[in-house]
């Protein structure tokens, strides 16, 4: 359904708001370092040419693709060059080369300042004055700090975030009403962040199909009862709108988004009884209810897997006829009745499965060589099942912050070279699987810890991306998707690696650290531990462990002190010289 | 009592299409392969072809393209849409029940009483 | 895929010991993926046999199937009045597009 102008479709599609909000992002995603005010004076013109081709899909320069649009709109920023560097050699690009160079250019860890949450009374101020303002200005900071954040969906996190205000500044107690709500929008959307991130990462570094197994393997888990056809169509929809969204495609994105949610909805007969509710709301809430809705219940008398798939005479000629759609059909009907089982975990059987069906249908007796694969997915399926009741264990013996500490020890022996924010970061959110997923019984454990691993140890792979240190952390991240979580598991302590320089600055601490929450308070605590383990990545747990309850209560007591600050310089030395003579640094 | 009733079939005219259904009783549709076989007054047995407990169609090379096998394992039955019917597709149409779950083993072990089609102007 | 049996009629008595064979144009899957049925007129066929040589439930004993590959062999050891009927070899072969029957030996009273 080819149009006469790409921008004027788009602008009638989403309607003014959206497509002001969507553009912003856009922007904000590929400019990170540009001021908000120049953000929103390129949106508007962008939304002033929008207009006039609305009015005329023939006036000039219409008919071009939003790509050149934006592309050409992004390159008239004057400080491109001293801001941004070799980003500035984009522009001298033609499209698709300019929008790729763009992409490429996006940075996962900008170096922004931490945003900091004024006081309730200022942001109420704020959100009354110019309520628009405000809202663009959550678009903007988010945006850019989150480059490939899913479009949509920051458009439902925005109208949240203004519903917040909107009820809360009213209230008697505002920080009361509002402080929670924001914790909650702040929390939700890191993770809905990183979630996008592994989409995206899917499809930029392993390929469409990487993404759509993931797809089929999903939406079969949520839709157990749709049809086969039905969960294919689906996927190649899905397919298509997180191409867009991770291509920057954000209008083109937010448009099929929303197509979808409305196809769902139309036939949510065949494909879910669990819909009805996401179907009734707004747009915005249906397509985030829809992507968030529980499975549904299994047909009563699915048949057994293997009649089709080992015992059949046919599988080498269905496989050779469709290969990917054969395959397709196996991890569809492998996923609906595994509910219980992680997306990943599906992967790799699919993936042990293609394998054994390549090497098999080529031998002189397929069947009797292929006979026992099913066997073959027995110690895959208990790997991860023993890796989470182990840690879930420990996880429940030791707690959310001593379970974090363990995970810091364990991945800084294993990969030392990596930078001590990146690690300690990336263990914390490890970290957090036990009291997201642990509560949960048996048959949902593992879809939750797994996946949701994958998406913490994504955020480690393009972290590290950006500045490799690691040729371990490159290979378990680049080798193959669905092992990274089995890769990293499986590394030892790194033997190669050289201890780290003793520096007392590292362990110097002052009185500050005494009014940070207690958030913060560990994030230091924590930072110190990574450190200690690459000065002496040989200490033991209980080495480590002395030396980590010294430093608590040597926290603990000068913040406690009159003289705060002279408790932390005298304390302080003495706590690293028995630090460093218990490790024998 | 586990039994498998076909119905649909009749006259139709030539160029014309019909879909026979074949409900089973007494057991679960979903465990094993179904086929349909048929035989034209007099003549053999021809098989037709068969789908898969997990929905894979299998057909003679002679039905390819005209005939298509379907199930509704919620409503315990198969079917069978043929189209483009032609004189010599007059035959009592049987729906059986095969010994394995995945292919055509050859084996059918329960058959229905069949329905006669008849294709004529 | 031809079936061929042979021979396509045959009369005999009660008490005869009787032999029916089936020819494939190529091997049946496993060397053993064939089927005998019988059937008699107005009714639906019953499976005999499967696998060339395995006794279908509820069959009696003086049926009997041998034969491997492409050669295969119904007997009827001791003829009874009920075994009056058409008698068709079905084979599955390595795609289930290809199973075939074959035309039938019609078995009639002397």
């Known amino acids: 359904d080819a149009h006469k102008s790409e921008v004027a479709h788009r602008f009638k599609d989403l309607g003014e708001e959206n497509f002001k909000a969507l553009v912003l992002i856009a922007f904000a995603q590929y400019l990170q370092q540009c001021p908000f005010e120049d953000h929103v004076k390129l949106v508007n013109e962008v939304t002033e040419f929008a207009k006039t081709c609305v009015a005329d899909e023939s006036a000039e320069n219409c008919d071009k693709s939003l790509h050149t649009l934006f592309g050409d709109k992004l390159c008239t920023v004057a400080t491109l060059r001293e801001t941004y560097g070799e980003m500035a050699d984009c522009c001298a690009k033609q499209e698709p080369e300019r929008n790729e160079c763009f992409l490429q250019h996006k940075d996962d860890n900008p170096n922004l300042p931490r945003l900091v949450r004024p006081e309730v009374d200022v942001m109420c101020t704020a959100f009354h004055d110019n309520e628009e303002t405000f809202l663009k200005k959550y678009l903007y900071e988010i945006a850019r700090r989150h480059p490939y954040f899913y479009a949509p969906e920051l458009l439902f996190f925005a109208k949240r975030y203004k519903a917040a205000f909107t009820e809360c500044c009213q209230a008697a107690d505002k920080a009361a009403c509002l402080l929670p709500k924001l914790d909650e929008l702040r929390d939700e959307g890191k993770a809905s962040s990183a979630k996008q991130r592994l989409k995206c990462a899917s499809l930029q570094k392993f390929g469409e199909r990487a993404f759509k197994a993931w797809a089929v393997a999903r939406l079969s888990q949520r839709f157990p009862k749709a049809e086969f056809a039905e969960v294919s169509k689906l996927v190649t929809d899905l397919t298509k709108v997180h191409t867009e969204c991770c291509h920057g495609d954000l209008l083109e994105c937010a448009d099929d988004r929303a197509d979808l949610a409305k196809y769902i909805c139309e036939n949510q007969d065949s494909i879910s009884s669990k819909l009805k509710e996401c179907c009734e709301k707004p747009l915005l809430e249906k397509s985030h209810c829809i992507a968030e809705v529980e499975n549904d219940e299994m047909p009563a008398d699915l048949p057994s897997l293997a009649a089709d798939f080992v015992e059949s005479k046919d599988v080498c000629k269905n496989y050779a006829e469709a290969k990917d759609v054969f395959l397709g059909m196996f991890l569809y009907e492998y996923a609906r009745r595994h509910p219980d089982y992680s997306v990943v975990l599906l992967l790799r059987l699919a993936k042990t499965y293609e394998t054994t069906l390549e090497k098999c249908c080529a031998a002189a007796d397929p069947h009797e060589c292929y006979a026992k694969v099913f066997d073959e997915f027995k110690p895959l399926v208990e790997e991860p099942q023993n890796l989470i009741k182990q840690n879930c264990e420990l996880f429940e013996q030791l707690g959310e912050y001593k379970f974090q500490n363990a995970l810091l020890v364990r991945y800084t022996k294993k990969v030392p070279q990596v930078s001590t924010p990146t690690l300690v970061e990336v263990s914390r959110n490890l970290g957090k699987v036990g009291s997201k997923c642990c509560k949960h019984p048996e048959a949902k454990r593992m879809p939750c810890a797994e996946d949701y691993l994958s998406v913490v140890l994504n955020q480690l792979c393009v972290l590290h991306e950006k500045t490799p240190v690691s040729d371990r952390v490159t290979k378990c991240c680049t080798e193959s998707l669905v092992n990274r979580r089995p890769c990293f598991s499986a590394l030892e302590v790194d033997e190669t690696y050289v201890p780290k320089e003793f520096n007392a600055e590292t362990f110097t601490f002052h009185a500050d650290i005494c009014t940070l929450s207690e958030k913060e308070r560990q994030i230091k605590k924590q930072t110190a531990l990574v450190e200690l383990v690459k000065h002496k990545p040989k200490a033991t747990k209980e080495q480590l462990k002395a030396v980590m309850d010294d430093f608590a209560a040597f926290v603990e007591k000068c913040c406690k002190a009159d003289d705060k600050e002279t408790c932390f310089a005298e304390e302080g030395k003495k706590l690293v010289a028995a630090s460093q003579a218990a490790l024998g640094l | 009592e586990v039994q498998l009733v076909e119905s649909g079939g009749g006259l139709v005219q030539p160029g014309g299409s019909l879909r026979l259904s074949c409900a089973a009783s007494g057991f679960s549709l979903s465990s094993n392969a179904m086929g349909w076989v048929r035989q034209a007054p007099g003549k053999c047995l021809e098989y037709i072809g068969i789908?898969?407990?997990?929905?894979?169609?299998y057909y003679a090379s002679w039905a390819k393209g005209r005939f298509t096998i379907s199930r509704d394992n919620s409503k315990n039955t198969v079917y069978l849409q043929m189209n483009s019917l032609r004189a010599e597709d007059t035959a009592t149409y049987f729906c059986a029940r095969d010994r394995h779950g995945g292919d055509s083993s050859g084996a059918f072990y329960l058959w229905g009483q069949g329905t006669l089609v008849t294709v004529s102007s | 895929i031809q079936m061929t049996q042979s021979p396509s009629s045959l009369s005999a008595s009660v008490g005869d010991r009787v032999t029916i064979t089936c020819q494939s144009s190529?091997?049946?899957?496993?060397?053993?993926?064939l089927s005998w049925y019988q059937q008699k007129p107005g009714q639906p066929p019953k499976l005999l046999i499967y696998?060339?040589?395995d006794l279908a439930s509820g069959v009696p004993s003086r049926f009997s199937g041998s034969g491997s590959g492409t050669d295969f062999t119904l007997t009827i050891s001791s003829l009874q009045p009920e075994d009056f009927a058409t008698y068709y070899c079905?084979?599955?072969?390595?795609?289930?597009?290809?199973?075939?029957f074959g035309c039938g030996t019609k078995l009639t009273v002397l």
């Open positions: 789908i898969s407990v997990g929905g894979f169609t």
């Open positions: 190529e091997s049946v899957y496993s060397n053993n993926q």
């Open positions: 079905a084979g599955g072969f390595s795609s289930s597009s290809d199973t075939a």
């Open positions: 696998d060339a040589s």
